[in-house]
């Protein structure tokens, strides 16, 4: 996900940094700007129930992390749900995973000092054909 | 996703903050700590092709954002793929979306000053029944 080291023409109005480790340590404004004004997250919220690979959402809370609450998907079945509402064991429900960035308090319990951390979260599930290895 | 305002016992070794807006503006170390050492991201990399609701991945690049590269899923079909490899008109491929946090350079082009931003990304696709039949 992360591509670092891009050279950006510097804006003369940028804050100055006297940090010896600059640009490893940066200032971050935690007033979140939400770019999702046009989207309605409620609209896709029932997919977890209507999918052929349905999932449950589990709350993962960690006060040392920002955001402190993350929802993790766990597939309900190993197989997928067929048209009759039964589990089809010829197909597999699998989690779709994504690496996301979070802020980890460092040193621990510090309210204003963080380190960037990459974590893998399961966002939902999809139904896939299993890989069958044919023996010669 | 975000739950703020948790009271944390302060570590006496924390950096001092003289920022008037504290704790709105915090210090973040960009040396990413990767918690995913036990996982093999390659393992889920072919789900996009094997799913009954397959998707393509599109590169979204923005040098003013950190991470600058994010991959967006676009469902290949409107319907889902059946066992014969043909479309099933009775089922729909839909994107699974997740709100993630990114860092936006603010003011623009500044290498050491960011604002937290929430964006909605499509991570993959799942196959859903279009109509939920409500029983009276």
């Amino acid at each position: 996900i992360v591509k670092a080291g891009i050279t950006i023409p510097r804006n003369p109005g940028c804050p100055n940094s006297e940090d010896k480790n600059f640009p490893r340590t940066v200032m971050v404004n935690l007033n979140i700007h939400n770019r999702n004004t046009n989207t309605n997250p409620k609209r896709s919220s029932d997919y977890y129930n209507r999918s052929t690979s349905p999932w449950n959402l589990h709350r993962n809370e960690d006060p040392e992390r920002y955001p402190s609450v993350i929802w993790e998907a766990k597939c309900r079945h190993l197989g997928c749900i067929n048209a009759d509402g039964n589990v089809d064991y010829h197909m597999n429900s699998v989690p779709i995973q994504q690496e996301i960035l979070v802020l980890r308090r460092e040193p621990p319990h510090c309210p204003n000092s963080f380190r960037l951390e990459k974590i893998l979260v399961s966002v939902g599930c999809t139904c896939v054909t299993p890989i069958v290895h044919h023996v010669a | 996703i975000v739950k703020a305002g948790i009271t944390i016992p302060r570590n006496p070794g924390c950096p001092n903050s003289e920022d008037k807006n504290f704790p709105r503006t915090v210090m973040v170390n960009l040396n990413i700590h990767n918690r995913n050492t036990n996982t093999n991201p390659k393992r889920s990399s072919d789900y996009y092709n094997r799913s009954t609701s397959p998707w393509n991945l599109h590169r979204n690049e923005d040098p003013e954002r950190y991470p600058s590269v994010i991959w967006e899923a676009k469902c290949r079909h409107l319907g889902c793929i059946n066992a014969d490899g043909n479309v099933d008109y009775h089922m729909n491929s839909v994107p699974i979306q997740q709100e993630i946090l990114v860092l936006r350079r603010e003011p623009p082009h500044c290498p050491n000053s960011f604002r937290l931003e929430k964006i909605l990304v499509s991570v993959g696709c799942t196959c859903v029944t279009p109509i939920v039949h409500h029983v009276a």
């Epitope: - | 079909h77 409107l78 319907g79 043909n86 479309v87 099933d88 839909v94 279009p130």
Partner: antibody
Framework: EVQLVESGGGLVQPGGSLRLSCAAS????????MSWVRQAPGKGLELVAI????????FYPDSVKGRFTVSRDNSKNTLYLQMNSLRAEDTAVYYC?????????????WGQGTLVTVSS | DIQMTQSPSSLSASVGDRVTITCRAS??????LAWYQQKPGKAPNLLVS???SLESGVPSRFSGSGSGKDYTLTISSLQPEDFATYYC?????????FGGGTKVEIK
């Protein structure tokens, strides 16, 4: 230039049969979903049949299911609609239409239509 | 089947007017909506798909909006060639269904 040309319409008695054809040109026919849509005189549009790019998937609404059959011959760039057990309410202009994708969900090109009249 | 209700069924407007046509689905159709224009004796012509995506070659005075069950086609400044009948079509749940049409006439 994309062109769809329907033929085979005409007057038929109730209970009779008719086969419509749609000749496609100006695009790679075998990669597009196709549909038949009809319009009764002075009325709105109604889906009749859908077929995906290779003919492996089809769909019919209840109003024609069991009486109409959609097929395609990709080697001849032609779409067909076989209509059996025709009824007065099947009277309409029949359009063939192309989906911009593989499957047949919405329609970016339409033919000029062929009129089917079911009457005794 | 999903019912598509278009309103108004007809309207009279003048060249230069802003015209709005609405389409209501009986269930959420998740933005899977197309708009067509049909002139007398002609086949329909696709204007918009995915509720908001304008087809190439369609003038920018046409725009689609909406979500859930409610969708709108707007013509920002009506031109002489826009007098026609407009249909919406959902493609979320088979059978795909069309609205009853809105006839835009010259005032």
């Amino acid at each position: 230039e994309v062109q769809l040309v329907e033929s085979g319409g005409g007057l038929v008695q109730p209970g009779g049969s008719l086969r419509l054809s749609c000749a496609a040109s100006g695009f790679t026919f075998s990669t597009y979903g196709m549909s038949w849509v009809r319009q009764a005189p002075g009325k709105g549009l109604e889906l009749v049949a859908i077929i995906n790019h290779n003919g492996g998937s089809t769909f019919y609404p209840d109003s024609v299911k069991g009486r109409f059959t959609v097929s395609r011959d990709n080697s001849k760039n032609t779409l067909y609609l076989q209509m059996n057990s025709l009824r007065a309410e099947d009277t309409a202009v029949y359009y063939c239409a192309r989906d911009p994708r593989h499957d047949g969900y919405f329609f970016d090109y339409w033919g000029q239509g062929t009129l089917v009249t079911v009457s005794s | 089947d999903i019912q598509m209700t278009q309103s108004p069924s007809s309207l009279s407007a003048s060249v230069g007017d802003r015209v709005t046509i609405t389409c209501r689905a009986s269930e959420d159709i998740y933005d899977r909506l197309a708009w067509y224009q049909q002139k007398p004796g002609k086949a329909p012509n696709l204007l918009v798909s995915g509720a908001t995506s304008l087809e190439s070659g369609v003038p920018s005075r046409f725009s689609g909006s909406g979500s859930g069950k409610d969708y709108t086609l707007t013509i920002s400044s009506l031109q002489p060639e826009d007098f026609a009948t407009y249909y919406c079509q959902q493609y979320w749940s088979v059978p795909w269904t069309f609205g009853g049409g809105t006839k835009v006439e010259i005032k």
